[in-house]
Interface confidence: low
C-alpha cells in the first residue's frame, strides 16, 4: 500500500480580521495509526495549534468528526481571527509510540494571510497658531492594519497635495502595520473655514476610504489691520474717533486707547461683527473733550490680538483749530520688532 | 497671467542708495511670499531672503543683514528691496521671485520670477 | 548652509539627445529641492519643485528625480530651445542654497 501522504491542498490563505479561518488537511492513508497536530511555524519554536489527542483550544473546531474509524479530513476551523493569528501552519501526522507518539509526516503548510482595517486616521496639527504665508505640519496616523500595502493621499479643502512625507512601520515582515504621515500646508487669509483631510486606502475597506480631518481655524490666526478716523464733531469741545480693527481671528482680542501715551481706556472685543470668511471685524471709539488739552493731542489705538505684541496706529488730533472735518492717519506703528532674522 | 515687473536698471555712485521695486500683476501680492535673489556678474545665484507679504515680516539671509531692507506698499501690488552705501561689490541683477509660502523650516521653491533689474555700481 | 555640486559644469550634446544633470546636496535635504533653466540675459525659469512634480507648462521631456543627498534632472530629447543654464536649489534648511549651474550648449 502507498505511503500516507498528509496534503494541505490550500498554500495560502486570506482572512479578513474578526472571521474565521479554515484550514484544509487530508490523509490519503488510514496508516499508520496515530493522532494529527496543527503547529504554527515550524521547527523546534513552533506553536501547537491544535491536538486531537488532548488539550482545550477554545478557537478551534474541527470540520469532520476526528472520532470517526474512517476519518481521513483533519481540516479545521480558527474562530475570530486576528492579525497576530497570521503565519505558517502545518497539518502533522503522528505514528502511536510508547511512550510518546511520534512525528511520522507533514503536510506542506498553509499560509494564513489576515486582512485587517486600518484604524481611524487621527489629524493632528501644530501646537501654536500660525499667520498667512506661514506652512505648518500636520500629521496623520492610523494603526493595526494588514497587509502592509496601503495608500494615503492628503487633501486641502477637496484638493489633493503633494507635499508630504510617508512611512509605513515596520519596514520588515509584522503580524500589522501603522502609517504615519506628515504634510506641509501653507495657510492663506481665507483658512479659517478650510479643512486638512487625510485619506486611507486599503484592501480591507473596500473602495471606501477612512477619512481624518483637522479644521485650520484651529492652526490660523489672522492678525488685523487697524484704521483710525476721526468722526465729525458731535458737541462743542467734543471729538469722536473710532479704531476699526478688520479681519482678525481668533476672536480673543484687547484694545487698548492711549491719549499722548496715557492708557485712557482699555477693553476685549465683545460684540464683534463676522465676516465670510470666518475672520472677524470690531470697532471701538473714543469721545474725546478737546477742551481738557491745550497741545495737540495723539491718540493712539493699540491693539493685542491672540497674546501676540501689540500694534498700534496713531492719529493726530489737532486742538488748536477745533476739527471739523475727518483726520488724517499716520503711518501703523508695530510696538514688537517687526523683523525676524534666523541665523 | 501671473507676472513679476521689476523697475529698470541703475547706475549709481559708490556711497549712493537704490531702490529696485517689483510689481505684481495677476494675482494678489499679500497671498504670496516675495524672495529676492542676487547674481553678479557671470555668477550664479544667491538667495537674499523674503519677506512675508501679509503681515510684512522680512527675513535676512547671513550676508543681506545691514544695508539691504525689504519693504512693500500693498496698495500698488510692490515689493521693494533697498540697498544702502553701495559698493562695487553690489553690480548685480537683482530678482524678485515669488515661492507659495514660506516654511519656517523648509523654505520654498521659487514658482514666478521677475526679468531682473541690473544696479552697477561705479565711480 | 548645505552646498549643492552639480555635475557635470557644463555639457555638449545635440538635439534628440537624451541629457541627465545630476545634483548633489551637502546633507540630506528630504525632497525639498527645485529645478531652473536659465538662457543668457533672462530671469530664470522654473521647472520642478519637491524634485519630481513639473510645474505647468513645463514640457513632460523633463523629468525630475531622487531624494536625500541626489538628484537627477533629464531631458529625454533635447529641443533648440533646452539649450541654456541649469540651476538646482535646495529648500530644505536656511539659508536656500542654489548650485553653480550646468550649461549645456550644442555640440
Known amino acids: 500500500e502507498e505511503e500516507l501522504q498528509v496534503i494541505q491542498p490550500d498554500k495560502s490563505v486570506l482572512v479578513a480580521a474578526g472571521e474565521t479561518a479554515t484550514l484544509r488537511c487530508t490523509a490519503t492513508s488510514l496508516i499508520p495509526v496515530g493522532p494529527i497536530q496543527w503547529f504554527r511555524g515550524a521547527g523546534p519554536g513552533r506553536e501547537l495549534i491544535y491536538n486531537q489527542k488532548e488539550g482545550h483550544f477554545p478557537r478551534v473546531t474541527t470540520v469532520s468528526d476526528l472520532t470517526k474509524r474512517n476519518n481521513m479530513d483533519f481540516s479545521i476551523r480558527i474562530g475570530n481571527i486576528t492579525p497576530a493569528d497570521a503565519g505558517t501552519y502545518y497539518c502533522v501526522k503522528f505514528r502511536k509510540g510508547s511512550p510518546d507518539d511520534v512525528e511520522f509526516k507533514s503536510g506542506a503548510g498553509t499560509e494564513l494571510s489576515v486582512r485587517a482595517k486600518p484604524s481611524a486616521p487621527v489629524v493632528s496639527g501644530p501646537a501654536a497658531r500660525a499667520t498667512p504665508q506661514h506652512t505648518v505640519s500636520f500629521t496623520c496616523e492610523s494603526h493595526g492594519f494588514s497587509p502592509r500595502d496601503i495608500t494615503l493621499k492628503w487633501f486641502k479643502n477637496g484638493n489633493e497635495l503633494s507635499d508630504f512625507q510617508t512611512n509605513v512601520d515596520p519596514v520588515g515582515e509584522s503580524v500589522s502595520y501603522s502609517i504615519h504621515s506628515t504634510a506641509k500646508v501653507v495657510l492663506t487669509r481665507e483658512d479659517v473655514h478650510s479643512q486638512v483631510i487625510c485619506e486611507v486606502a486599503h484592501v480591507t475597506l473596500q473602495g471606501d476610504p477612512l477619512r481624518g480631518t483637522a479644521n485650520l481655524s484651529e492652526t490660523i490666526r489672522v492678525p488685523p489691520t487697524l484704521e483710525v478716523t476721526q468722526q465729525p464733531v458731535r458737541a462743542e469741545n467734543q471729538v469722536n474717533v473710532t479704531c476699526q480693527v478688520r479681519k482678525f481671528y481668533p476672536q480673543r482680542l484687547q484694545l487698548t486707547w492711549l491719549e499722548n501715551g496715557n492708557v485712557s481706556r482699555t477693553e476685549t472685543a465683545s460684540t464683534v461683527t463676522e465676516n465670510k470668511d470666518g475672520t472677524y471685524n470690531w470697532m471701538s471709539w473714543l469721545l474725546v473733550n478737546v477742551s481738557a488739552h491745550r497741545d495737540d493731542v495723539k491718540l493712539t489705538c493699540q491693539v493685542e490680538h491672540d497674546g501676540q505684541p501689540a500694534v498700534s496706529k496713531s492719529h493726530d488730533l489737532k486742538v488748536s483749530a477745533h476739527p471739523k472735518e475727518q483726520g488724517s492717519n499716520t503711518a501703523a506703528e508695530n510696538t514688537g520688532s517687526n523683523e525676524r532674522n534666523i541665523y | 497671467q501671473i507676472q513679476l515687473v521689476q523697475s529698470g536698471s541703475e547706475l549709481k555712485k559708490p556711497g549712493a542708495s537704490v531702490k529696485v521695486s517689483c510689481r505684481a500683476r495677476?494675482?494678489?501680492?499679500?497671498?504670496?511670499?516675495m524672495n529676492w535673489v542676487r547674481q553678479a556678474p557671470g555668477q550664479g545665484l544667491e538667495w537674499m531672503g523674503f519677506?512675508?507679504?501679509?503681515?510684512?515680516?522680512?527675513t535676512y539671509a547671513q550676508g543681506f543683514k545691514g544695508r539691504f531692507v525689504f519693504s512693500l506698499d500693498t496698495s500698488v501690488s510692490t515689493a521693494y528691496l533697498q540697498i544702502g552705501s553701495l559698493k562695487a561689490e553690489d553690480t548685480a541683477v537683482y530678482y524678485c521671485?515669488?515661492?507659495?509660502?514660506?516654511?519656517?523650516?523648509?523654505?520654498?521653491?521659487?514658482?514666478?520670477w521677475g526679468q531682473g533689474t541690473l544696479v552697477t555700481v561705479s565711480s | 548652509d548645505i552646498q549643492m555640486t552639480q555635475s557635470p559644469s557644463s555639457l555638449s550634446a545635440s538635439v534628440g539627445d537624451r541629457v541627465t544633470i545630476t545634483c548633489r546636496a551637502s546633507?540630506?535635504?528630504?525632497?525639498?529641492l527645485a529645478w531652473y533653466q536659465q538662457k543668457p540675459g533672462k530671469a530664470p525659469k522654473s521647472l520642478i519643485y519637491?524634485?519630481?512634480y513639473r510645474y505647468i507648462g513645463v514640457p513632460s521631456r523633463f523629468s525630475g528625480s531622487g531624494s536625500g543627498t541626489d538628484f537627477t534632472l533629464t531631458i529625454s530629447s533635447l529641443q533648440p530651445e533646452d539649450f541654456a543654464t541649469y540651476f538646482c536649489?535646495?529648500?530644505?534648511?536656511?539659508?536656500?542654497t542654489f548650485d553653480q549651474g550646468t550649461k549645456l550648449e550644442i555640440k
Open positions: 536649489q535646495q529648500y530644505n534648511t536656511y539659508p536656500l
Open positions: 546633507q540630506n535635504v528630504g525632497t525639498h
Open positions: 521671485a515669488r515661492t507659495r509660502g514660506y516654511y519656517d523650516f523648509d523654505g520654498g521653491a521659487f514658482d514666478y
Open positions: 519637491s524634485a519630481i
Open positions: 519677506i512675508n507679504t501679509y503681515t510684512g515680516e522680512p
Open positions: 495677476g494675482y494678489t501680492l499679500t497671498d504670496y511670499a
